[in-house]
Interface confidence: low
Amino acid sequence: GDTRPRFLWQPKRECHFFNGTERVRFLDRYFYNQEESVRFDSDVGEFRAVTELGRPDAEYWNSQKDILEQARAAVDTYCRHNYGVGESFTVQRRVQPKVTVYPSKTQPLQHHNLLVCSVSGFYPGSIEVRWFLNGQEEKAGMVSTGLIQNGDWTFQTLVMLETVPRSGEVYTCQVEHPSVTSPLTVEWRARSESAQSK
Amino acid sequence: IKEEHVIIQAEFYLNPDQSGEFMFDFDGDEIFHVDMAKKETVWRLEEFGRFASFEAQGALANIAVDKANLEIMTKRSNYTPITNVPPEVTVLTNSPVELREPNVLICFIDKFTPPVVNVTWLRNGKPVTTGVSETVFLPREDHLFRKFHYLPFLPSTEDVYDCRVEHWGLDEPLLKHWEFDAPSPLPETTE
């Protein structure tokens, strides 16, 4: 294989937004290999060496009035500007989740099982998934994959409930998400094999 | 207080491969990247291009600067090379699997550096190229990389799939397997 040594340079310009664009923090960061060497932080107001490797750059950039002024203005000229350009298709993007409930194994009643609530294809990632048994929230015995980013501007998550289903029981998966005004619910009845959407 | 949103302009330049990347990230998703060979902006979702524009030439200029700066830093560091960090690989589907219902296999390659990987989809052990797609290298908060590869497929009980990943941090190619997990049939006596 190719065993030549590799050398990597990674600049990152980060804009962190709090409460819309009310508070903005700009970071201009430079990484050699995996190590940050120098950065500008708008909360600091000047370039700082993170490692000795970045000291010449910090000193040089701080000595250049134009570079420093440009960096100090970036919260507005760069961050707030880009937020405004992209807001409609990023910040405001909403995609409704698809909710499906199924048992992980097809087991007879009164056998230990795992009920799966699959929530997929949603955006943004903030979501609340709850399990109810006969209208009462189940807080114990819940296992989750956590939030999974699909890389295509959608998320998915699986929230499992460890249970021993009994005849007549109604299990409900409830999903709250910014794309919907009221929670989405899907029921699974211990008698039936299929989940029906409400 | 945790921020609501983060936008990152992430770039890299890698020697001696002379590979570079310029992309914008919003909360961990790619908004666009610039195709260095075609010198054009590639929007992650086609509709994004209807709302905004980005002059690709600016990214090319940045990459030229990145290349020069990498040479400076390489020398300044007394030619200290990067340490290979091997990827973690996960294969999952886009949505719950139903037989003969179109779905997408996702190969998620995570926590690796440098940003060079060779990824191959295998169906029943043979390479598949039809319909496959991939993302560029995506930044992580720890300054390692992530990458997604996709394979649209029709789930069946006959086919098995593997995502095969090669990286300098791995001693041998890493294969992550996926196959249809058919639920065992209900005993007839159930009720």
Epitope: P56, Y60 | A64, K67, A68, E71, I72, K75
Partner: antibody, heavy 120, light 109 residues
């Protein structure tokens, strides 16, 4: 403040060796990233880069003049010396030394230049 | 060796805008920063623009630099008589600094 000054003979004969000294102040050639270079300019012509020495004693030379040039530094004296062998009348020029504040950086401060005439 | 190509001369009337081009290749301008120097008659060159488009302190904002691919340009707006000088572009090619042939700017009138 940063200052550089070139010194050396104003007149050299063909085939002789030219030795030029650049004495500088206001910065140190031991600072990471810093370099000192030599550039010349024949009368009425363009600037031509000759050589550069950087903080860790790496030396870079113009391809076309490489065999004739030697650059060295004395960090304690704040001096950089350029020697050029086998001088020819076409080497008649104003010779400048200049500082580069970072590796592969621009020349941000220049000396006033010294005119060297090559004639028998 | 002159590796970067500049027009030998440009001219403009006071108050006008002029541009000076500098053409190179992938291995120099295409891969590295571009610097511009101003040389007034009988003096040493002075740094005007570095890192493609950055102005050192004290350089008026009438001077601006840009780079696109393997070419760069220097723009001077609101031309003044004291801008009459020679202008040189400079970049880097592998381990070598490279200069342009210089452009003489004449301010008319």
């Amino acid at each position: 403040q940063v200052q550089l000054k070139e010194s050396g003979p104003a007149l050299v004969k063909p085939t002789q060796t030219l030795t030029l000294t650049c004495t500088f102040s206001g910065f140190s050639l031991s600072t990471s990233g810093v370099g000192v270079g030599w550039i010349r300019q024949p009368p009425g012509k363009a600037l031509e880069w000759l050589a550069l020495i950087d903080w860790d004693d790496d030396k870079y030379y113009s391809t076309s003049l490489k065999t004739r040039l030697t650059i060295s530094k004395d960090t304690s004296k704040n001096q950089v010396v350029l020697t050029m062998t086998n001088m020819d009348p076409v080497d008649t020029a104003t010779y400048y030394c200049a500082r580069s504040p970072r590796y592969r950086g621009a020349f941000d401060y220049w000396g006033q230049g010294t005119l060297v005439t090559v004639s028998s | 060796d002159i590796v970067l190509t500049q027009p030998p001369s440009v001219s403009g009337a006071p108050g006008q805008r002029v541009t000076i081009s500098c053409s190179g290749s992938e291995s120099n301008i295409g891969a590295n920063y571009v610097t511009w120097y101003q040389q007034l008659p009988g003096t040493a060159p002075k740094l005007l623009i570095y890192d493609n488009n950055q102005r050192p302190s004290g350089v008026p904002d009438r001077f601006s630099g840009s780079k696109s691919g393997t070419s760069a340009s220097l723009a001077i707006t609101g031309l003044q008589s004291e801008d009459e000088a020679d202008y040189y572009c400079q970049s880097y090619d592998y381990d070598h600094y490279v200069f342009g042939g210089g452009t003489k700017l004449t301010v008319l009138g």
